[in-house]
């Protein structure tokens, strides 16, 4: 058993049918010695008396808010949560496996640049009685500071019969140098509590590996005289690290017909312009990627050929 | 030690070309190592990230773009600093600053070259003959060093009398390749910056 926060405790259980559970001793936070009784949640049934209460915690029915009283007055509370260990592996019931980029990916994180700011998000089908708390650091043995905000509900989607809820959090490394070569990964820890169930999820990454630039901005077309060709031009996104000559991007320009089946023409360039043939009803899209370290491509920025 | 915006030497352009070749070569070598050594801990998540140039060279700091010298986080990791604020820049020859940066890159390349050659000698003794260093990568390191055109003492190749532990050697190869790829990215960024300046 360990303390999650004041008066909230997590009991770790080896979770299998007929498991013996864990013996837990609760102590009433009071100078009083006599006439103390204990109850669980809203029930008025007295579970025991005395300054301490010994309970065998086996299942969720044994978890909850234990309260010690004296003469109708509440003295203190202890909330017990359960953390299930199923065959040597901590349970992951609360969050959905996003399966990207690999199985058992519960937290996904992205950064728009090398400033040390990043966003993480996760999915769940649970809509109520759910709380999250997020901590982060650079490295684990001698951790350096990363400050995270509060997790917020950022999207709701309908997936078949189920509703899916997306939560996200923004974090900022306290003293980040965009040009630094990372040798210690960022660690992100999310505590999730659903009713009386506690779970924790972690992710470890280097900022360089989670970079995803914003799409190029100011995408424009300039028709070339006496030609079906157009000059496409664009600019680096505002959120990208500067100077751009140091933090350079490379670009992919795509000409896509109305039909998804039509052949796509693609050009790769380090410049912020390209000459392409603009077909009728086609659209031109451009996306960006770090020129020197192949992390994710940005989303496409698009303009119609007409 | 910071990189000011300067008129590049005509010699910068071949360096940019060579640095791009270097990044391509080390990335290919790393990919090959990860595939060949699939039963070894060779992914970025599994290895310890060590930098053999730590405390010996200071390429990131020496080659810092002028725009980042105002960022305290980019300066506080320096042990010794020639320039601690932008106002000193005017009184110093920009070519001196560039020379410091480029010599630091040269020293990096020299250290990695020695490590890779020593490692290759060990890998050639492996009866499994599982993996060797790409000669192209070694050649590209050499070409960039020549293009940088610094004279420095040649470091003797380390020789080891004891029987090599091939498992450890292959893990060290992965560690070295990951670190060298990150340094090659920095070198490429620097060359691109100098080229544009």
């Amino acid at each position: 058993i360990w303390e999650l926060k004041k008066d909230v405790y997590v009991v770790e259980l080896d979770w299998y049918p007929d498991a013996p559970g864990e013996m837990v001793v609760l102590t009433c936070d009071t100078p009083e010695e006599d006439g103390i009784t204990w109850t669980l949640d809203q029930s008025s049934e007295v579970l025991g008396s005395g300054k301490t209460l010994t309970i065998q915690v086996k299942e969720f029915g044994d978890a909850g808010q234990y309260t010690c009283h004296k003469g109708g007055e509440v003295l203190s509370h202890s909330l017990l949560l359960l953390h299930k260990k199923e065959d040597g592996i901590w349970s992951t019931d609360i969050l959905k496996d996003q399966k990207e980029p690999k199985n058992k990916t519960f937290l996904r994180c992205e950064a728009k640049n090398y400033s040390g700011r990043f966003t993480c998000w996760w999915l769940t089908t649970i809509s109520t009685d759910l709380t999250f708390s997020v901590k982060s650091s650079r490295g684990s043995s001698d951790p350096q500071g990363v400050t995270c905000g509060a997790a917020t509900l950022s999207a709701e989607r309908v997936r078949g019969d189920n509703k899916e809820y997306e939560y996200s959090v923004e974090c900022q490394e306290d003293s980040a140098c965009p040009a630094a070569e990372e040798s210690l990964p960022i660690e992100v820890m999310v505590d999730a509590v659903h009713k009386l169930k506690y779970e924790n999820y972690t992710s470890s990454f280097f900022i360089r590996d989670i970079i995803k630039p914003d799409p190029p901005k100011n995408l424009q077309l300039k028709p070339l005289k006496n030609s079906r060709q157009v000059e496409v031009s664009w600019e680096y996104p505002d959120t990208w690290s500067t100077p751009h000559s140091y933090f350079s991007l490379t670009f992919c320009v795509q000409v896509q017909g109305k039909s998804k089946r039509e052949k796509k023409d693609r050009v790769f360039t380090d410049k912020t312009s390209a000459t392409v043939i603009c077909r009728k009803n086609a659209s031109i899209s451009v996306r960006a990627q770090d020129r020197y370290y192949s992390s994710s491509w940005s989303e496409w920025a698009s303009v119609p050929c007409s | 030690r910071n990189l000011p915006v300067a008129t590049p030497d005509p010699g910068m352009f071949p360096c940019l070309h060579h640095s791009q070749n270097l990044l391509r070569a080390v990335s290919n070598m790393l990919q090959k190592a990860r595939q060949t050594l699939e039963f070894y801990p060779c992914t970025s998540e599994e290895i310890d990230h060590e930098d053999i140039t730590k405390d010996k060279t200071s390429t990131v700091e020496a080659c810092l773009p002028l725009e980042l010298t105002k960022n305290e986080s980019c300066l506080n990791s320096r042990e010794t600093s020639f320039i601690t604020n932008g106002s000193c820049l005017a009184s110093r020859k920009t070519s001196f600053m560039m020379a410091l940066c480029l010599s630091s890159i040269y020293e990096d390349l020299k250290m990695y070259q020695v490590e890779f050659k020593t490692m290759n000698a060990k890998l050639l003794m492996d009866p499994k003959r599982q993996i060797f260093l790409d000669q192209n990568m070694l050649a590209v390191i050499d070409e960039l060093m020549q293009a940088l055109n610094f004279n420095s003492e040649t470091v003797p190749q380390k020789s080891s009398l004891e029987e090599p532990d091939f498992y450890k050697t292959k893990i060290k190869l992965c560690i070295l390749l990951h670190a060298f790829r990150i340094r090659a990215v920095t070198i490429d960024r620097v060359m691109s910056y100098l080229n544009a300046s």
């Epitope: 080896d14 979770w15 299998y16 049918p17 007929d18 498991a19 299942e59 969720f60 260990k85 199923e86 065959d87 040597g88 592996i89 019931d93 690999k102 199985n103 058992k104 089908t125 | 039963f39 801990p41 599994e46």
Partner: antibody, heavy 115, light 111 residues
């Protein structure tokens, strides 16, 4: 004590369907994940499928994906395996099993796919 | 397709020490705990070892388990006639959990 009693096995022709049941008692069935495991005659153990305690997630071996469906009825304390498009290579003893460091197995039920 | 490899058979005389190996990889045994089962003819498997080296109550202490790196082993010290059975190791793979990964199985013969 924990008990898992299986039923529903038998002889079936290729291409036909069969449903296996596993009745649980002696524990809070709705709190635990459950597996199906099979063993072809003279062969080793092969995992078939898993279902979470609340039925929200199901996982299958590639060899049965798209043909077999694992399900549970927590109000009846029963686990099911619906087997469709059966093949000769599905012939085996099928076991249900609880998930956890200490597990409990059903007695097994024989499924024979033969024409 | 079994990812955990066991020797097909091992044998020993009563009182001898018999060991069975179970070889896997970094993503399964290297990352997860190992169980061992004993299966007597015509019966369901019986749990002998969980958590690499833990014995459930009721399992004789002549059975012991261990794990090192990407391999695990089961030892029977002082093998007895009633130990003649098939033995299976079981683990998980980090990418496919909760799918059970079984070993190929080992037939123990007591001579």
């Amino acid at each position: 004590q924990v008990q898992l009693v299986q039923s529903g096995g038998g002889v079936v022709q290729p291409g036909r369907s069969l449903r296996l049941s596993c009745a649980a008692s002696g524990f809070t069935f709705s709190s635990y994940g459950m597996h199906w495991v099979r063993q072809a005659p003279g062969k080793g153990l092969e995992w078939v499928a898993f279902i979470r305690y609340d039925g929200s997630n199901k996982y299958y071996a590639d060899s049965v994906k798209g043909r077999f469906t694992i399900s549970r009825d927590n109000s009846k304390n029963t686990l099911y395996l619906q087997m469709k498009s059966l093949r000769a290579e599905d012939t085996a003893v099928y076991y249900c099993k609880t998930h956890g460091s200490h597990d409990n197995w059903g007695q097994g039920t024989m499924v024979t796919v033969s024409s | 397709s079994y990812v955990l490899t066991q020797p097909p058979s091992v044998s020993g005389t009563p009182g001898q020490r018999v060991t069975i190996s179970c070889s896997g990889g970094r993503s399964n045994i290297g990352d997860n705990t190992v169980k061992w089962y004993q299966q007597l003819p015509g019966t369901a498997p019986k749990l002998l070892i969980y958590g690499n080296d833990q014995r459930p109550s009721g399992v004789p202490d002549r059975f012991s388990g261990s794990k090192s790196g990407t391999s695990a082993s089961l030892a029977i010290t002082g093998v007895q006639a009633e130990d003649e059975a098939d033995y299976y190791c079981q683990s998980y793979d980090r990418g496919t959990h909760p799918a059970l990964l079984f070993g190929t199985g080992t037939k123990v013969t007591v001579l």
